[in-house]
Interface confidence: low
């Protein structure tokens, strides 16, 4: 997956730091105070649709076969720049019973972006 | 995730059968001859962006917090109807050396759709 460098407008991963204080979650999340969540942005022209290279690969490759052949309804289906690989992160937080929980939360960090 | 029923245009899962013969893969895929891959389609208005309810949930919920507050660059970031839960499937196929391989291929079947 591409890293956004400001030079291309093709689907890429953009660095972004989330502050839990900013979104009002610091009352239940003990640590960390924030993290690099990142996000995906950019265009998905038809020639790179389905080139996610990761988690959606088989499915998106199959769908792209139909899309490239102009098969309805895929010809009009817009391809999107989305996370294709996400990574977990350890967090320390309070549960409803005010117990302190340490847990790996799945899909917190965007590692790669691709066109759906 | 919603199932598409033709009545709504909100992001939903659409049933779709893939025929390996149709896409010219029947020369290397022994079985099955096809499968219900499904796909996602529909609108993602801002109030349901980030409500994937599954694999992208934490990340998309966080990003949506910023989006709902009109935080640049997320306010203009378009939310997409994408697979949020995929399922593997067993396949029998020939590898490059013409050996017969039986393998669970990850992320073949779209189980749920959501707004990124």
């Amino acid at each position: 997956g591409l890293e956004c460098d400001g030079k291309v407008n093709i689907c890429c991963k953009k660095q972004f730091f989330v502050s839990f204080k900013d979104i009002g979650w610091n009352d239940w999340i003990i640590a960390p105070s924030g993290y690099h969540a990142n996000y995906c942005e950019g265009e998905c022209p038809s020639h790179i649709a389905g080139t996610s290279g990761s988690s959606l690969s088989f499915h998106s490759t199959v769908i792209n076969h139909y899309r490239m052949r102009g098969h309805s309804p895929f010809a009009n289906l817009k391809s999107c720049c989305v996370p294709t690989k996400l990574r977990p992160m350890s967090m320390l937080y309070y549960d409803d019973g005010q117990n302190i929980i340490k847990k790996d939360i799945q899909n917190m960090i965007v590692e790669e972006c691709g066109c759906s | 995730g919603l199932e598409c029923d033709g009545k709504v245009n909100i992001c939903c899962k659409k049933q779709f059968f893939v025929s390996f013969k149709d896409i010219g893969w029947n020369d290397w895929i022994i079985a099955p001859s096809g499968y219900h891959a499904n796909y996602c389609e529909g609108e993602c208005p801002s109030h349901i962006a980030g409500t994937s309810g599954s694999s992208l949930s934490f990340h998309s919920t966080v990003i949506n917090h910023y989006r709902m507050r009109g935080h640049s660059p997320f306010a203009n970031l378009k939310s997409c109807c994408v697979p949020t839960k995929l399922r593997p499937m067993s396949m029998l196929y020939y590898d490059d050396g013409q050996n017969i391989i039986k393998k669970d291929i990850q992320n073949m079947i779209v189980e749920e759709c959501g707004c990124s």
């Epitope: 105070s33 320390l92 117990n99 340490k102 847990k103 | -």
Partner: antibody, heavy 121, light 107 residues
């Protein structure tokens, strides 16, 4: 091979503070919990609190809240436990312990040798 | 916090016999339970984690079972080096809590 090496025995006066160190070697320091467990003479094990060095934030057992401070220095792979307002009942062996694997909900596979803190006037 | 209760407090067993130690949690800890062995003047040693998985280098005579709130540590045939204090510990939630211990002594 993971090793946790603690600082030496201390004798302290009531009302004072003690700071015990725990130096880790033989593994990634940042992503693993370092926990502190104490054991008073002839008594059982008592969890005081823990820190995930990469976060730099600690959590403490309610009993010790406000009296204990757990910190970690990633540059030296060392964790510290400071206990203030010492009283005679704080006389105990203090252990640092580390979880078995990176991630969550793992037991303490690695233990320091223990530091005896004696509080006496 | 989750209270861990061990029984019996003391268990007198002859070498070669079987020892069964119990641990009860005040609420479910799933399988997030460990057993430790401690000998005088030594740090605790991890025996079992995940309620039933033996830690590296632990002999097969040690086995753990249970989930939720009821757990058991079994030592199938006690050796002289097994006479020690055994603690259960839940690590499902912080604060992490230990049981009061069971002392296994020679009969």
């Amino acid at each position: 091979q993971v090793q946790l090496v603690q600082s030496g025995a201390e004798v302290k006066k009531p009302g004072s503070s003690v700071k015990v160190s725990c130096k880790a070697s033989g593994g990634t320091f940042s992503n693993y919990d370092i926990n502190w467990v104490r054991q008073a003479p002839g008594q059982g094990l008592e969890w005081m609190g823990g820190i995930i060095p990469v976060f730099g934030t600690a959590a403490y057992a309610q009993k010790f809240q406000g009296r204990v401070t757990i910190t970690a220095d990633e540059s030296t792979s060392t964790a510290y436990m400071e206990l203030s307002s010492l009283r005679s009942e704080d006389t105990a062996v203090y252990y640092c312990a580390r979880e078995a694997r990176d991630g969550y909900r793992y037991a303490f596979q690695h233990w320091g040798q223990g530091t005896l803190v004696t509080v006496s006037s | 916090e989750i209270v861990m209760t061990q029984s019996p407090a003391t268990l007198s067993v002859s070498p070669g016999e079987r020892a069964t130690l119990s641990c009860r949690a005040s609420q479910s800890v799933s399988s997030n339970l460990a057993w430790y062995q401690q000998k005088p003047g030594q740090a605790p040693r991890l025996l079992i984690y995940g309620a039933s998985t033996r830690a590296t280098g632990i002999p097969a005579r040690f086995s753990g079972s249970g989930s939720g709130t009821e757990f058991t540590l079994t030592i199938s045939s006690l050796q002289s080096e097994d006479f020690a204090v055994y603690y259960c510990q839940q690590y499902n939630n912080w604060p992490i809590t230990f049981g009061g211990g069971t002392k296994v002594e020679i009969k």
